[in-house]
Structure formats: structure tokens, C-alpha cells
């Protein structure tokens, strides 16, 4: 077996060795959001182009319905970029009586799914007040980890506001993950 | 051949098996830039330190002339961050009839060429609106992902304004990418 | 040893391979920060949680006394997400006579400390000035980079102001390395 | 208070070397390029060259064989020499921070040399 | 070299008025290019830089415009204060240079 090398008169045994070109592999890129219905206070997620340009899944980690499936448990890098873009006008639209005013915010969540769990697990967030004076304005919210996942765990990408997303370059919003 | 294991009577191949220690590796630290003419409607792209202070490179990972070279087809992490400072008094200074102010903006582009493709290709874009009143300002564009390479791509650091790239500190201002 | 192959006749020897799996890696969250004295013109040192939730340590990379312990010599790749909150009713509080005003700002550092060297070495810094007219604000400042470290080098995350660290999350404030 | 403060002989004969120095308080030193400039009597501006803290250069190719700019940290100062110089080199010497780059954001009072015998 | 031209050498002009400055490269510098102003026994003030973004601290009378060759200070309605010589200066290559300046003087 891979990581078992043998010596003419006896045998070791290591940890398991692999090829690094076989571990699963994604990076996906964005299209444009379709508006779907999505679950009162929970963040719709993001979908994906898995196939065309820069994007690609590889070595069983296979991408569908949303979410990247984890095809083998291990430690994983996972990242996602989203551009977000909107209009701003005032930063303290939003008054409210006693405290100070709320502001507007765009909030990225990388969230994983077991299925023998009934909750979600969040495990990575950005979010960011937006509070721009009288233009439009644009920013990337960046997030990146190493976690340790499980065979058939599921990755998706939920944002506060679908809306708001620039889904109009591959280099612009993306998600990925790869074993470690 | 590494990834193959010898017993006394018969022999197992692998896909193969490769040190860690030897893969291609690269973290470049910012330089004070010198103004150089740039083609019009292309971003200028930035030169980097690469032997002295944090910055290395090794293992064939080469830096020429604006650019690192891989010498190895495989999937890359490849990352960025560029310190952006400047001034500002406005954020609407540019006034457009009939639609919001555009922005002012800074942006950073990790961009792969190969040779065999006549166009550039836009891996990874972080690109934000500055709407600071009254103050100097100084902010962070982070990028990283991974990307499937081939031997003999280049990849360079293309930012908006050259002039606002903050060159002070190698901690601030990098660019890297290693072979996974 | 690992990377010596042997056949029944002679021996060929390669560069060491290892098992990935048994790599040093550490993924560390945060937890409520206590106040305490620091170094004057020396910014604070935050503290983590590394054995609850989403965090771990393995592999002989260990965590204590705020800082992450580097038990193998080799590159790394270390990365930090440190959200900040705070509130600011105006960008230019803080008048100086004579020149522009000084903005508000948070920086984020992750710093090597060896132990035969007097200074630490600041590895990655990102820092961002502030401005949010007239509301509370919150933003993340993300940091990742690969790192040629040794043995013995202990790394810790540095914060401008400990008392704005959002530290009600796991997912948004957070420390990580692992051996590439 | 960012304030830059020339000093230096001002008059100095031809063929001799110019010297003056930048005094830099009221900011972080470390953190910009600092500029020579000059102006003729009545005439425009010439940059003449930069520094960081860590002792990096640019000169101005047009007087880069008679230019030296260096840099005292645990001073906050900065210096200029030009060797050789002329009646062509008679003119206010400016210093100045360069922010965010190749910009001159704050500018010392200036000197004037006289070069004459 | 790149050399900047400014005209006119001299503008007369009365307070209330616009006034217009024109800075010319003898090759492209993208947006690199500042303004600066300059009072007699004073040193020289940022004004503009990037062809359009006010320095901190500018009266929005002053914009900027203009990229490649061709560049315009514009003061929307001339002060008292305003009265001075002003200068451009590039930054798209090296060396840095700055023009031979624009007097712009009370009529």
C-alpha cells in the first residue's frame, strides 16, 4: 500500500501517503442569481458556475444544487470573495428612537451543512457596515480558513442580500475549497 | 520513480508522490515604484522585492520583470494584498447628468498571461469605492484563490493608480503563490 | 525513513515524502478579550480559543499564552479575519493644525516572535482607516500569506484597539496556520 | 503639526559642494519618501530627488552624478549635498513629503543658496 | 523627458471671474498629473493631483480635469486669495517634471 515501504527483510508502515493532483478540488465562479424564495431569517445562497472559464470541480468534490459536496473527510482550505454594489444616499436613513441609527450592511456567510445535524454550522463571516454619501459604491468582502470536514458534508454561500451581489466577472465572486 | 514502492518480489505503481519541501513557492514584498509609462486602458502593474526581508522564492518558482513564472503545470493558491492611501475631500466630485456620481475607486487585478493566448487573462479583481470626507485614507484590498496553471504561464499585479499604492512596509503590500 | 525506497538489490533515496494528514495545523476562534497591560507603542496581543467549536490544534502545533507555537520548521501558510466594531460620530475629530486631519484607524498585524531574535517581525499587516459618519460600524480586516518559518517561532495576532474586536462570533474573528 | 524645517549655509562657492538639511517632526518618519526641490530666482520648480527611511533614492538623471540625498532616523532629518556646484545651482531649496507618491503634500519654508565667489 | 507647456504664461483677470489654466505633456501621462499654487516667498501647495481629486483641505473652486496630454485647472470663481502663480507637475514618468508655470494676476 501507498505510504508502506518495504525493506528486504522487514516492513514499515506509515501514515498514508497520496498524491497531491488527486485531492478533491473547486473553485467555483458566479452567474447571475435567479430571485428564489429562501427561509425567513436565513440568508439566501449564492449558485454557481462549477464548468466554464476559470471554474472547475475535480477528484470527486462535485458541485450541485448550491452547495459543494465534501467527498472525503480531512481538512480543507475553503475561501469565497463577493463583490457587492448598491446605492447609497444617506447613512442614517435609519433612525431609531434612544440609540444611535442602524446602519445598512452587507454580510457574507460560508456556511456548512450536515445532514445529521438539524442546524447549519457558519463558519466563516463578513460583514461590513455600508454608510456611502450620495454615490454608488462597490466592495469585495473576502473570507478564508482552514476546518475540518467530513465525508458528505455540504458548503454553500449565503448573503444578506442577493441583490446586491456583482455577478458580472468570474474574477469578482468565487467560492472555493481544496484539501489540504 | 518516486511513488513507486518496492517489495522483495513485485512492484506497485502510484500516482506520483512528490516532497512537499519541492514544490514551486513564491511570497514577493511591495517596492517603491517608479512612474513608468503604461499602455493606455490597461492597468500598470506592479514590481515586487524578491530575495531580501520575507520575500523568497524557490523551487523553480521564478520573478522577472513585473512577473513570477511557473514552472510547473499543477493548481495554485495565489494571493494578494495591496495598501491603497491617498486623499480625499469629495465623494461626488464627478458629477453625471441624470444618473448617481460615479465613484472614485481602487482596484487590484491578478492577472495570468501565457504566451500561446494574444489577451490576458483576469484571474482574481478586488475593486472598492473611496468616498473618505475631509481626510487622508488608507485601506487593504485582499485576494486569494486557487487556479489551475500550466508551465510556462506569468502572473503579475495590476493595480488602478500606481501612484496610491502604499510601498512603505512588506507586510502591507505582497503578492504570493505556491503549488498545492 | 519516509522517502527511502527500497528494492530488493539497492536502495534509491528521495527527498522526504509525509503523510499530509499529520502536518502541524491550527484554526484558532475568538473568545471575549480581558483587558491587560501591554508594551507602550506595542499593540495588543488578542487570545483564542483553540480547543471549542470550529477550533482545534494538531499535530503538535500548540497554542498558548496567545501564541501559536511552530513545532516543525518549514513554509506555512497563516492567515487571520479580525472584525472590528466601534462607533464614530465624525471622520475629523481629531483636528491637527497645519496639516490634514488624522483619521480614525484599525490595523490588524500577525507577528513572528523568535526567541533569538530581540525584535519581533511584523509578517502581515492590515490597516484601515475609519470614517463612518453618525452610526456604528463594524468591518473586517482579513490577512493570508505564506510564511518560511522555523522551529521555535511562536506567532501571535496584534490589534490597534482591543476593545473594538468583535468577539461575539467564532466566524468572525479567527487564526489559522498550517504547514504547506 | 507635520512641520518641515530647511537649514543650512546660504551661500556657498562655486565649485564646492552644497549642504543642507530637512528637520521632519509632528509625524511618523518611516512611513513616506522625502523629497529635495528647487527654484531658480523667478524661474519654475526641478525635483532634484527622494529618500525612505530605509536609505532607498531616486535622483533627477539631470544632476544624478553630483546628488547625494541621505537620511538620519534617530535624527528625523534628512540631507542634500550637491558637489560642484555653479551659479546655475543658485536657487530656493525646498524639502517636502511625498504623499501618496511622487506628490509633494507638504512643503518646508524653503532656503535659498547663493552660489557665488 | 517628459515636458509640460502651460498657457497662458499670464492671466489678467478680475475677482468673481473663471479663470482656466492648460498644462500639456509632450506624452501621455495617464491621470498622473497635480497642481499646484504658489504665493511670492511662499512654498508651493498641493492643489490637485490625479488630474481631478481635490487635496485635503481645497475649495471646491478648484477642479481638475483632463488625462493623456492635455490638462485644465479650472478656479469656478476667482478670490482675492487666488491670485498667485500656479504650476502642473507629472508624475507618469521619470523624472518628475513641472511646467514653467501660469501667473494668474489681478486685471
Known amino acids: 500500500l501507498k505510504g508502506q515501504e518495504f525493506a528486504p527483510s522487514h516492513q514499515q508502515v506509515y501514515a498514508p501517503l497520496r498524491a497531491d493532483g488527486d485531492k478533491p478540488r473547486a473553485h467555483l465562479t458566479v452567474v447571475r442569481q435567479t430571485p428564489t424564495q429562501h427561509f425567513k431569517n436565513q440568508f439566501p445562497a449564492l449558485h454557481w458556475e462549477h464548468e466554464l472559464g476559470l471554474a472547475f470541480t475535480k477528484n470527486r468534490m462535485n458541485y450541485t444544487n448550491k452547495f459543494l459536496l465534501i467527498p472525503e473527510s480531512g481538512d480543507y482550505f475553503i475561501y469565497s470573495q463577493v463583490t457587492f454594489r448598491g446605492m447609497t444616499s444617506e447613512c442614517s436613513e435609519i433612525r431609531q428612537a434612544g440609540r444611535p441609527n442602524k446602519p445598512d450592511s452587507i454580510t457574507v456567510v460560508i456556511t456548512k451543512v450536515t445532514d445529521s445535524y438539524p442546524e447549519p454550522t457558519q463558519l466563516l463571516m463578513g460583514t461590513k457596515s455600508v454608510c456611502e454619501v450620495g454615490s454608488n459604491w462597490f466592495q469585495p468582502i473576502y473570507l478564508g480558513a482552514m476546518f475540518s470536514l467530513q465525508e458528505g458534508d455540504k458548503l454553500m454561500v449565503n448573503v444578506s442580500d442577493i441583490s446586491l451581489v456583482d455577478y458580472t466577472a468570474e474574477d469578482k465572486t468565487f467560492f472555493g475549497a481544496f484539501l489540504l | 520513480l518516486k511513488g513507486q514502492e518496492f517489495a522483495p518480489s513485485h512492484q506497485q505503481v502510484y500516482a506520483p508522490l512528490r516532497a512537499d519541501g519541492d514544490k514551486p513557492r513564491a511570497h514577493l514584498t511591495v517596492v517603491r515604484q517608479t512612474p513608468t509609462q503604461h499602455f493606455k486602458n490597461q492597468f500598470p502593474a506592479l514590481h515586487w522585492e524578491h530575495e531580501l526581508g520575507l520575500a523568497f522564492t524557490k523551487n523553480r518558482m521564478n520573478y522577472t520583470n513585473k512577473f513570477l513564472l511557473i514552472p510547473e503545470s499543477g493548481d495554485y493558491f495565489i494571493y494578494s494584498q495591496v495598501t491603497f492611501r491617498g486623499m480625499t475631500s469629495e465623494c461626488s466630485e464627478i458629477r453625471q447628468a441624470g444618473r448617481p456620481n460615479k465613484p472614485d475607486s481602487i482596484t487590484v487585478v491578478i492577472t495570468k498571461v501565457t504566451d500561446s493566448y494574444p489577451e490576458p487573462t483576469q484571474l482574481l479583481m478586488g475593486t472598492k469605492s473611496v468616498c473618505e470626507v475631509g481626510s487622508n485614507w488608507f485601506q487593504p484590498i485582499y485576494l486569494g484563490a486557487m487556479f489551475s496553471l500550466q508551465e510556462g504561464d506569468k502572473l503579475m499585479v495590476n493595480v488602478s493608480d500606481i501612484s496610491l499604492v502604499d510601498y512603505t512596509a512588506e507586510d502591507k503590500t505582497f503578492f504570493g503563490a505556491f503549488l498545492l | 525513513l519516509k522517502g527511502q525506497e527500497f528494492a530488493p538489490s539497492h536502495q534509491q533515496v528521495y527527498a522526504p515524502l509525509r503523510a499530509d494528514g499529520d502536518k502541524p495545523r491550527a484554526h484558532l476562534t475568538v473568545v471575549r478579550q480581558t483587558p491587560t497591560q501591554h508594551f507602550k507603542n506595542q499593540f495588543p496581543a488578542l487570545h483564542w480559543e483553540h480547543e471549542l467549536g470550529l477550533a482545534f490544534t494538531k499535530n503538535r502545533m500548540n497554542y498558548t499564552n496567545k501564541f501559536l507555537l511552530i513545532p516543525e520548521s518549514g513554509d506555512y501558510f497563516i492567515y487571520s479575519q479580525v472584525t472590528f466594531r466601534g462607533m464614530t460620530s465624525e471622520c475629523s475629530e481629531i483636528r491637527q493644525a497645519g496639516r490634514p486631519n488624522k483619521p480614525d484607524s484599525i490595523t490588524v498585524v500577525i507577528t513572528k516572535v523568535t526567541d533569538s531574535y530581540p525584535e519581533p517581525t511584523q509578517l502581515l499587516m492590515g490597516t484601515k482607516s475609519v470614517c463612518e459618519v453618525g452610526s456604528n460600524w463594524f468591518q473586517p480586516i482579513y490577512l493570508g500569506a505564506m510564511f518560511s518559518l522555523q522551529e521555535g517561532d511562536k506567532l501571535m495576532v496584534n490589534v490597534s484597539d482591543i476593545s473594538l474586536v468583535d468577539y461575539t462570533a467564532e466566524d468572525k474573528t479567527f487564526f489559522g496556520a498550517f504547514l504547506l | 503639526e507635520l512641520q518641515l524645517q530647511e537649514s543650512g549655509p546660504g551661500l556657498v562657492k562655486p565649485s564646492e559642494t552644497l549642504s543642507l538639511t530637512c528637520a521632519v517632526s509632528?509625524?511618523?518618519?518611516?512611513?513616506?519618501?522625502w523629497a529635495w526641490i528647487r527654484q531658480p530666482p523667478g524661474k519654475g520648480l526641478e525635483w532634484i530627488g527622494d529618500i525612505n527611511h530605509r536609505g532607498h533614492t531616486n535622483y533627477n538623471p539631470s544632476l544624478k552624478s553630483r546628488v547625494t540625498v541621505s537620511i538620519d532616523t534617530s535624527k528625523n532629518q534628512f540631507s542634500l549635498k550637491l558637489s560642484s556646484v555653479t551659479a546655475a545651482d543658485t536657487a530656493v531649496y525646498f524639502c517636502?513629503?511625498?504623499?501618496?507618491?511622487?506628490?509633494?503634500?507638504?512643503w518646508g519654508q524653503g532656503t535659498l543658496v547663493t552660489v557665488s565667489s | 523627458d517628459i515636458q509640460l507647456t502651460q498657457s497662458p504664461g499670464t492671466l489678467s483677470l478680475s475677482p468673481g471671474e473663471r479663470a482656466t489654466l492648460s498644462c500639456r505633456a509632450s506624452?501621455?501621462?495617464?491621470?498622473?498629473l497635480a497642481w499646484y499654487q504658489q504665493k511670492p516667498g511662499q512654498a508651493p501647495r498641493l492643489l490637485i493631483y490625479?488630474?481631478?481629486k481635490r487635496a485635503t483641505g481645497i475649495p471646491d473652486r478648484f477642479s481638475g480635469s483632463g488625462s493623456g496630454t492635455d490638462f485644465t485647472l479650472t478656479i469656478s470663481r476667482l478670490e482675492p486669495e487666488d491670485f498667485a502663480v500656479y504650476y502642473c507637475q507629472q508624475y507618469g514618468d521619470s523624472p518628475l517634471t513641472f511646467g514653467q508655470g501660469t501667473k494668474v494676476e489681478i486685471k
Open positions: 517636502a513629503r511625498d504623499f501618496p507618491n511622487f506628490i509633494f503634500d507638504f
Open positions: 506624452q501621455s501621462v495617464s491621470t498622473y
Open positions: 509632528g509625524v511618523s518618519f518611516s512611513d513616506y519618501h
Open positions: 490625479g488630474a481631478s
